[in-house]
């Protein structure tokens, strides 16, 4: 996170780390005891799910191994529509007031809307900073008329825009399929943006979580 | 200060096989994507493909596809490059490129390997 | 797939002259334009990013300009180490990342 700040700690009961042996890949979302959401484009062969801290590599964090993933069908690592993917973890989280899962949203939240995003990402960029903290940046909902005079076609209809103008806080390295919560509810996951991270006016782009809700329920009930 | 260090020159039989590596040495490449890009002699840059280091996932330029793969060990920071069924029009330089950006995208090259030069000849 | 034009495709040029290379797209980029420097043997490298964007460590005589189809890399006064053949290409419809066909500087 670039310009961001600390997260209140305990605040992001539903934060999690994807990581590759024991270092960050990406972020992710607790959405139910046994899954995980993300973005397609953090696709391993497995991963080590840390749960249950702001502390990235916290010993007395919850680790969970997941050998199983399903990315969104539609996923297109050409255009990268569709950038969403559940993780099932190999056993069930021990819920806690440390560990909680997030609410999928009821609707679409409207541009101008205030949400935070989080992740244990870089605050450096090019050169990268990777902090041990939880970082937050609080951002607003930018409509995709907004958004396209900045990206044009490159954003998707199921692509969601988000950011301060004239400010440099967004999301970079390490944060993707991270959470951007908006009025308590999953919004969108961090999926890509302009390099170096942190060019003023230039939005972070997420996957719009409202519009994938019923692929979220349907793949979790497939795969129980 | 990372840097990109490729494997050396190779001289093959057409109808063979190629692989080239590419090594990150003082770092890694794991936020990115690799990208081959080559130059046959006196001739201008063309692009192969790449890499996502994030997630193995792989686009190839469609002149190659069928031909050419390309994989990445992330243990030891290197990327690979194999290059099928030879014909001397493959002759030329093979680079290695970091692809910068973040998440999904990935906008432009700002790191390069040395080149190797490969040669096909009967 | 996007076809990127350099022109010209050689050019011959002065110590101190002020260099205009141009690139046009076959179709809009919007500004995901990038121009790299290539000397004979040698490895190509990052100058200019998303058209106007100076790569750090890059000097100050290089800039880069242009949105939707035309741009231009200016090079303001010349000097000996730029006598080399540059490159742009285009990240706006990737893959396939598309290469300009080069420009040669050479020495008058």
């Known amino acids: 996170i670039i310009d961001g700040y600390k997260c209140k700690e305990g605040s992001h009961p539903w934060q999690v780390a994807l990581l590759k042996g024991n270092q960050l890949h990406c972020g992710g979302v607790l959405v139910d005891k046994y899954w995980v959401l993300t973005a397609a484009h953090c696709k391993m062969g497995q991963y080590q799910v840390q749960l249950g801290s702001d502390k990235i590599g916290d010993q007395s964090a919850q680790k969970i191994k997941a050998t199983k993933s399903f990315r969104h069908p539609g996923y297109s690592t050409k255009t990268h529509v569709n950038d969403i993917m559940l993780v099932r973890l190999d056993e069930p989280v021990k819920m806690s007031s440390k560990v909680e899962a997030v609410q999928l949203p009821e609707h679409c939240e409207p541009p101008g809307t205030s949400c935070t995003v989080s992740g244990w990402g870089t605050t450096t960029s090019p050169d990268v900073t990777f902090p041990s903290d939880l970082m937050c940046s609080d951002v607003k909902l930018i409509s995709s008329r907004e958004c396209k005079k900045v990206y044009k076609d490159l954003l998707g209809k199921t692509m969601l825009c988000a950011g301060i103008p004239d400010s440099k806080t967004n999301t970079c390295n390490g944060d993707s399929g991270g959470p951007l919560v908006c009025n308590d509810t999953l919004q969108g996951l961090v999926s890509w943006g302009t390099y170096p991270c942190g060019q003023p006016n230039d939005p972070g782009v997420y996957t719009q979580v409202c519009k994938y809700k019923r692929w979220v329920m349907e793949t979790m009930k497939t795969h129980r | 200060q990372v840097q990109l260090v490729q494997s050396g020159a190779e001289v093959k039989k057409p109808g063979s096989s190629v692989k080239v590596s590419c090594k990150a040495s003082?770092?890694?490449?794991?936020?990115?994507?690799i990208s081959w890009v080559r130059q046959a002699p006196g001739q201008g840059l063309e692009w192969m493909g790449w890499?996502?280091?994030?997630?193995?996932?792989?686009n190839y330029a469609q002149k190659l596809q069928g031909r050419v793969t390309m994989t990445t060990d992330t243990s030891t920071s290197t990327a690979y490059m194999e290059l099928r069924s030879l014909r001397s029009d493959d002759t030329a330089v093979y680079y290695c490129a970091r692809a910068a950006g973040y998440g999904a995208r990935h906008w432009y090259f700002d790191l390069w390997g040395q080149g190797t030069m490969v040669t096909v000849s009967s | 797939d996007i076809q990127m034009t350099q022109s010209p495709s050689s050019l011959s040029a002065s110590v101190g002259d002020r260099v205009t290379i141009t690139c046009r797209a076959s179709?809009?980029?919007?500004?995901?334009l990038n121009w790299y420097q290539q000397k004979p043997g040698k490895a190509p490298k990052l100058l200019i990013y998303?058209?106007?964007s100076l790569q750090s460590g890059v000097p100050s005589r290089f800039s880069g300009s242009g949105s939707g189809t035309d741009f231009t890399l200016t090079i303001s006064s010349l000097q000996p180490e730029d006598f080399a053949t540059y490159y742009c290409d285009q990240s706006y419809s990737t893959p396939p990342i598309t290469f300009g066909g080069g420009t040669k500087v050479e020495i008058k």
């Open positions: 179709q809009s980029i919007s500004s995901y």
């Open positions: 998303g058209a106007s």
């Open positions: 890499i996502s280091a994030y997630s193995g996932d792989t």
């Open positions: 003082g770092g890694t490449f794991s936020n990115y994507a």
